[in-house]
Amino acid sequence: CKAMHVAQPAVVLASSRGIASFVCEYASPGKATEVRVTVLRQADSQVTEVCAATYMMGNELTFLDDSICTGTSSGNQVNLTIQGLRAMDTGLYICKVELMYPPPYYLGIGNGTQIYVIDPEPCPDSDF
């Protein structure tokens, strides 16, 4: 089978500070040295890119400076963290993995992680 399987949790609840973390694990059919990981958000039939990082196996993920994502890698496992989430960002977040080099190229698409974000209640005014 030449398909690459990508596993990610079905559901994650973001913290009260709007931070959600999940693991994206892929079963590599080949010995990849350069991997690209993309987080996609699917709402209805629209798919948008949340963030993306390319890394050399054994090195750290490098997201752009203004990215809302951070992450670390360990073998075929990527630990992803998305920050700054609000209730309106609740949705399905898909992990996409591409083995860019060496040939052949492989694409892996996860089933998605439903991230639930609940905006914190504002603190009540206090006399103290």
Partner: antibody, heavy 118, light 108 residues
Framework: EVQLVESGGGLVKPGGSLRLSCAAS????????MHWVRQAPGKGLEWVSF????????YYADSVKGRFTISRDNAKNSLYLQMNSLRAEDTAVYYC???????????WGQGTMVTVSS | EIVLTQSPGTLSVSPGERATLSCRAS???????LAWYQQKPGQAPRLLIY???SRATGIPDRFSGSGSGTDFTLTISRLEPEDFAVYYC?????????FGQGTKVEIK
């Protein structure tokens, strides 16, 4: 409007060269992989070449390897295909296509005809 | 290389009838990586189905995809006049990207 527009096709003699261009608009070009696909007259679709987001990685069909070179200029939202040592069997309509976020070719240009004949 | 074989080569159907197109892969293709395209004469291909069964934006629900492993099917439940065209399956899970040879759906 989200679209791809190819140009550069034409008539060329065997052994000649041609450079195709594909102008992208209406989307963030650098966030997508890109492909060239061709279709010989009356035949099916044949994938020709792929280029990664930043242009660092390129893949080619065996039939064009060593003769064709794919490239992109993200600043100009443009994709290119340099075709050298052209053969009669390279005669086809050449399409540029966007590799969608989930993988399929979700956006295609209208195509440009390349005819290789003496 | 994954070879995709489509059948039949030509399908003659009357408008309003159902059309069933087959695509068989030489080795297992993950269902997430199988697409169907429609092409009309003089036009570029148009994405219909991706991930074996998800309809692309703007595609009517008379088009549906199914299958897994090596056998995939595109079904057009009730053929409209504009559906007579050539249909291609494609795998996009690994390089080289490959297409089937196409099935022509013609008016009976």
């Amino acid at each position: 409007e989200v679209q791809l527009v190819e140009s550069g096709g034409g008539l060329v003699k065997p052994g000649g060269s041609l450079r195709l261009s594909c102008a992208a608009s209406g989307f963030t070009f650098s966030s997508y992989t890109m492909h060239w696909v061709r279709q010989a007259p009356g035949k099916g679709l044949e994938w020709v070449s792929f280029i990664s987001y930043d242009g660092n990685y390129k893949y080619y069909a065996d039939s064009v390897k060593g003769r064709f070179t794919i490239s992109r200029d993200n600043a100009k939202n443009s994709l290119y295909l340099q075709m050298n040592s052209l053969r009669a069997e390279d005669t086809a309509v050449y399409y540029c296509a966007r590799g969608g976020h989930l993988g399929p070719f979700d956006l295609w240009g209208q195509g440009t005809m390349v005819t290789v004949s003496s | 290389e994954i070879v995709l074989t489509q059948s039949p080569g030509t399908l003659s159907v009357s408008p309003g009838e159902r059309a069933t197109l087959s695509c068989r892969a030489s080795q297992s293709v993950g269902s997430s990586y199988l697409a169907w395209y429609q092409q009309k004469p003089g036009q570029a291909p148009r994405l219909l189905i991706y991930g074996a069964f998800s309809r692309a934006t703007g595609i009517p629900d008379r088009f549906s995809g199914s299958g897994s492993g090596t056998d995939f099917t595109l079904t057009i439940s009730r053929l409209e006049p504009e559906d007579f065209a050539v249909y291609y399956c494609q795998q996009y899970g690994s390089s080289p990207w490959t297409f089937g040879q196409g099935t022509k759906v013609e008016i009976k």
